[in-house]
Interface confidence: low
C-alpha cells in the first residue's frame, strides 16, 4: 500500500493528461482526485502509465467505490481492466453489450484469462441468457467460446442466437455439447430451404438424430466424410447401405479410407455384406449372407 | 395416431414439489422432429408455455420458471416429466402436455391434468 | 398478463361470419409468421386451428381462416355453426424473449 503523504505544492492534478507519467507513485497517490479520475477514465488509456502507477490508479478507484464500480467507469477501464482480479470483477454489475466489448478488447489475441472469464460469467448471468448479440461478441472474440459452457449453460442459448454461430466456434464441441445445440439449430434454421439449410445445419450434426439423417439422405446433400465421421455412432448405426450412399453422394467413396475408423467401422460391422458389396469399394466386415440379423436393439443388449 | 396423456398428484402443498409425466403413445418420442412441452391454463383461462424437452434430454424453458423447473425425458417408457418446485396457490392450473413442430406449432395436446395448490 | 390482447367476448348468429382479433408488437405477430390459433370447449383440450398465421391443418373445416396485417393477427370463422362456440386462443412466438406466448382468450358466443 501507498503511504499516505500530502501532495506538494501546485501538483495537484487539475485534469487526466500526460504531465502524470512524470509523478512518483506517491505523488499520483496524493494528487490525483479519485472523482477526477472516475470521470475523466477514458483519458487513462491514451497515457502511457507504467504498470506500477495502473496500480495507484487502481488502488485510488478500489477506494473510492469499495463495492464495485460503476458502469460508467468500467467501459472506459481499458487497459487497467488487466490489472483487476477476479474478485473485482465479481462485485460489478456489467449490462451493456458495448462494456463488455471495450474490455474484450483489451485482451484481444490473449487466451481467455481468469478475468475475462469472471467477466463474461457476470455479463451472461445479468442478461439471463445468451442471447444473439453477446453470442455473436463473444464467439468473434473467443471462436471456442462455446464449446467451453457446458451442456446445462448452453441449455440457455436461445434458438435465435444459433444464427451468430460460426463452423469454426463448433470445431472443440463434443457430442454432448452438440446434443443439445442441434435442437436448437435446427428450429433457428427451419424455413430455409434445403441446400441453405443443410449449409447452416452441417456444423450442428453431431447432435442429429437417425431420422434427422434419413431425412437428409432424401434431399442430395452430399454430406463430406469430415462431417459424417462426427456423426453420432448411435445415430449412423441404423441407416441403410442405401442411405449412406444417398447421404454422402460422390463422396461415399471416402469410405474406404474409414473403414477401420468409428462410425463407419461400427457401421460396417451392422450392414449385410452383399449390401455393402453394392457400394463396389471392396468394404469388409458386414454380416455374412445368410446369417439372421437380430433386431438393433436385442443386438445393442447383447453386446 | 399419436396421442398425450398427463398423469400426476392433483393435490400439491404448498412449497413442495409438483411432479407430472406425460405418455406419449402411437408414436416415438425419439423422433427428431419434435419438441415434447408443457403448458398450463390458470383458472383465469389464459395459457402460458412452460418448456420443452427434445428426445436427447435438451430443454428449453420459460425465464420466469426456469429456476424451480425440471423437465426430463425417458425414451425406453416414450415419456417426458416435468418437477415444478417450491409451488404456491399461483401454481394452480390445468397442466398440459402438448407435441411442438416446426413453426412453433402445438398440434397434438393431452387432455390436461388439474393441479391444486393447497394445504 | 399476456403480451397479446384478444377481445374478452366476440358473438353471432349462425350463418354470420365473425373476426377474432390478437393484437401483439413487431417481435411477435408483426415481426414474425408463427401465428397459431387454437380452439379450446369446455372442459376440452385445445385443437390446432390455424398455424403460420393461414395455413388449416387437415381436418379443420375451411370456415375458419387466418389473416395477419401489421402487428395485429386475426381469425375469421365464416358460417357460424352452434359447434363452434368456443374459447379461442392466439399463440406466437416471440422473437424478445425466445418463447412462445399466447393470448388470454376470446369467448365466441353463437346466438
Known amino acids: 500500500e501507498v503511504e499516505k503523504t500530502a501532495c506538494p505544492s501546485g501538483k495537484k492534478a487539475r485534469e487526466i493528461d500526460e504531465s502524470l507519467i512524470f509523478y512518483k507513485k506517491w505523488e499520483l497517490e496524493a494528487c490525483v482526485d479519485a472523482a477526477l479520475l472516475a470521470t475523466q477514465m477514458d483519458r487513462v488509456n491514451a497515457i502511457p502509465f507504467t504498470y506500477e502507477q495502473l496500480d495507484v490508479l487502481k488502488h485510488k478507484l478500489d477506494e473510492l467505490y469499495p463495492q464495485g464500480y460503476p458502469e460508467s467507469v468500467i467501459q472506459h477501464l481499458g487497459y487497467l481492466f488487466l490489472k483487476m482480479s477476479p474478485e473485482d470483477i465479481r462485485k460489478w454489475n456489467v449490462t451493456s453489450l458495448e462494456t463488455l466489448k471495450a474490455l474484450l478488447e483489451v485482451n484481444k489475441g490473449h487466451e481467455m484469462s481468469p478475468q475475462v472469464a469472471t467477466l463474461i460469467d457476470r455479463f451472461v448471468k445479468g442478461r439471463g441468457q445468451l442471447d444473439k448479440d453477446t453470442l455473436d461478441t463473444l464467439t468473434a472474440f473467443y471462436p471456442g467460446y462455446l464449446c467451453s459452457l457446458s451442456p446445462e449453460e448452453l441449455s440457455s442459448v436461445p434458438p435465435s442466437s444459433i444464427w451468430a454461430v460460426r463452423p469454426q466456434d463448433l470445431d472443440t464441441c463434443d457430442p454432448r455439447q452438440l446434443d443439445v445445440l442441434y435442437p436448437k439449430a435446427r428450429l433457428a434454421f427451419q424455413n430455409m430451404n434445403g441446400s441453405e439449410y443443410f449449409v447452416k445445419i452441417q456444423s450442428f450434426l453431431g447432435g442429429a438424430p437417425t431420422e434427422d439423417l434419413k431425412a437428409l439422405s432424401q434431399q442430395n446433400v452430399s454430406m463430406d466424410l469430415a462431417t459424417f465421421m462426427k456423426l453420432r455412432t448411435d445415430a449412423v448405426l441404423p441407416l441403410t447401405v442405401a442411405e449412406v450412399q444417398k447421404l454422402l453422394g460422390p463422396h461415399v467413396e471416402g469410405l474406404k479410407a474409414e473403414e477401420r475408423h468409428r462410425p463407419v467401422r461400427d457401421w460396417i460391422l451392422r450392414q449385410r455384406q452383399d449390401d455393402l458389396d453394392t457400394l463396389g469399394l471392396g468394404l469388409q466386415g458386414g454380416i455374412p449372407n445368410g446369417y439372421l440379423v437380430l433386431d438393433l436393439s436385442m443386438q445393442e443388449a447383447l453386446s | 395416431q399419436v396421442q398425450l396423456q398427463e398423469s400426476g398428484p392433483g393435490l400439491v402443498k404448498p412449497s413442495q414439489t409438483l411432479s407430472l409425466t406425460c405418455t406419449v403413445s402411437g408414436g416415438s418420442i425419439s423422433s427428431g422432429a419434435y419438441f415434447w412441452s408443457w403448458i398450463r391454463q390458470h383458472p383465469g383461462k389464459c395459457l402460458e408455455w412452460i418448456g420443452y424437452?427434445?428426445?436427447?434430454?435438451?430443454?428449453y424453458t420459460n425465464p420466469s420458471l426456469r429456476d424451480r423447473l425440471k423437465i426430463s425425458v425417458d425414451t425406453s417408457k416414450n415419456q417426458f416429466s416435468l418437477k415444478l418446485s417450491s409451488v404456491t396457490a399461483a401454481d394452480t392450473a390445468m397442466y398440459y402436455c402438448?407435441?411442438?413442430?416446426?413453426?412453433?406449432?402445438?398440434?397434438?395436446w393431452g387432455q390436461g391434468t388439474m393441479v391444486t395448490v393447497s394445504s | 398478463q399476456s403480451a397479446l390482447t384478444q377481445p374478452a367476448s366476440v358473438s353471432g348468429s349462425p350463418g354470420q361470419s365473425i373476426t377474432i382479433s390478437c393484437t401483439g408488437t413487431s417481435s411477435d405477430v408483426g415481426g414474425y409468421n408463427y401465428v397459431s390459433w387454437y380452439q379450446q370447449h369446455p372442459g376440452k383440450a385445445p385443437k390446432l386451428m390455424i398455424y403460420?398465421?393461414?395455413n388449416r391443418p387437415s381436418g379443420v373445416s375451411n370456415r375458419f381462416s387466418g389473416s395477419k396485417s401489421g402487428n395485429t393477427a386475426s381469425l375469421t370463422i365464416s358460417g357460424l355453426q352452434a359447434g363452434d362456440e368456443a374459447d379461442y386462443f392466439c399463440q406466437v412466438w416471440d422473437s424478445s424473449s425466445d418463447h412462445v406466448v399466447f393470448g388470454c382468450g376470446t369467448k365466441l358466443t353463437v346466438l
Open positions: 424437452i427434445y428426445y436427447s434430454g435438451s430443454t
Open positions: 402438448a407435441r411442438e413442430g416446426a413453426g412453433y406449432v402445438f398440434d397434438i
Open positions: 403460420e398465421v393461414s
